[in-house]
């Protein structure tokens, strides 16, 4: 079977700023030297691209400059980290993997993470 | 909502060349990869050829390598096909279909008939 | 290059009925990586199915498909006047993207 797996943790918890990072991982049936990584969000049956980046193996993973996530990749290992997160962006997180080149393509998809986000309280007013 | 529309029908000869176009509305063009697709009359789908949303990496089915030319426009939301040395199992419906983001061909133009025949 | 090989060729059914459909690989295919396509005469495909089982935005859901590894099947439960048309079996899961030769549900 030439399928790619793709693997990521079924569950994380964002820290109190906001910022929530897991670790994608993908088999890898053919040598690729361009990969392409979108984090997807899947809400009911929508699912729309939250940020993806394409880089060349052995070279640093690049987001756009207006991303909400940030990356480094090592071998058939990517790091993600997305930010800005608040509690409306509670949900599941899929990690999606294709190899660009050379052909053959390949497309990885992963189940997915369930990121969990909580709203820090406010501080309460001091009267010191 | 996403709308596809090829362009481009027409009976040529074989050996001559035709370019099939796919205007695309509704959506953000250039953020997604895009495909033809053809079928011959009374047979089943064959993928021919993907192109990246950035247009810089394609692919191509083996019996169009060397012949069919596949780009895009991002500026214009425009897909295009250019077909040389037409043959005439060439003929059929050709498609341009959107590639979804999981994967699966999601929206389809209404297809143009190209007719090889001398 | 997979290869998919649909089953039976056409289906002789009547509204109301079950029709399930087959869709055979040649070598192993990931369940992510597999789609149902529905064409009717003088139309384009319309995805009914991917990932082998979660139905397209506005696909009822007498349409619903199983499978893994080799073997996929595409089931609708009550067949009304509107399903009977061409399905197509794909996998998306590496180049070149291949299709199935068709089912044709027809009325019996």
């Known amino acids: 079977c030439k399928a790619m797996h793709v693997a990521q943790p079924a569950v994380v918890l964002a820290s109190s700023r906001g910022i929530a990072s897991f670790v994608c991982e993908y088999a890898s049936p053919g040598k690729a030297t361009e990969v392409r990584v979108t984090v997807l969000r899947q809400a009911d049956s929508q699912v729309t691209e939250v940020c993806a980046a394409t880089y060349m193996m052995g070279n640093e993973l690049t987001f756009l400059d207006d991303s909400i996530c940030t990356g480094t990749s090592s071998g058939n290992q990517v790091n993600l980290t997305i930010q800005g997160l608040r509690a409306m962006d509670t949900g599941l997180y899929i990690c999606k993997v294709e190899l660009m080149y050379p052909p053959p393509y390949y497309l990885g998809i992963g189940n997915g993470t369930q990121i969990y986000v909580i709203d820090p309280e406010p501080c309460p007013d001091s009267d010191f | 909502q996403v709308q596809l529309v090829e362009s481009g029908r027409g009976i040529v000869q074989p050996g001559r060349s035709l370019r099939l176009s796919c205007a695309a509305s509704?959506?953000?063009?250039?953020?997604?990869?895009m495909h033809w697709v053809r079928q011959s009359p009374g047979k089943g789908l064959d993928w021919v050829a993907f192109?990246?949303?950035?247009?810089?990496?394609?692919y191509y089915a083996d019996s169009v390598k060397g012949r069919f030319t596949i780009s895009r426009d991002n500026s214009k939301n425009t897909l295009y096909l250019q077909m040389n040395s037409l043959r005439a199992e060439d003929t059929a419906v050709y498609y341009c279909?959107?590639?979804?983001?999981?994967?699966?061909?999601?929206?389809w133009g209404q297809g143009t008939l190209v007719t090889v025949s001398s | 290059e997979i290869v998919l090989t649909q089953s039976p060729g056409t289906l002789s059914l009547s509204p109301g009925e079950r029709a399930t459909l087959s869709c055979r690989a040649s070598?192993?295919?990931?369940?992510?990586?597999l789609a149902w396509y529905q064409q009717k005469p003088g139309q384009a495909p319309r995805l009914l199915i991917y990932?082998?089982?979660s139905r397209a935005t506005g696909i009822p859901d007498r349409f619903s498909g199983s499978g893994s590894g080799t073997d996929f099947t595409l089931t609708i439960s009550r067949l009304e006047p509107a399903d009977f048309a061409v399905y197509h079996c794909?996998?998306?899961?590496?180049?070149?993207?291949?299709f199935g030769q068709g089912t044709k549900v027809e009325i019996k």
């Open positions: 192109i990246w949303d950035d247009g810089k990496n394609k």
């Open positions: 794909q996998q998306f899961g590496s180049s070149p993207w291949t």
């Open positions: 279909a959107r590639k979804g983001q999981l994967g699966p061909f999601d929206s």
């Open positions: 070598q192993s295919v990931s369940s992510s990586y």
């Open positions: 509704g959506f953000t063009f250039s953020s997604y990869g």
């Open positions: 990932g082998a089982s």
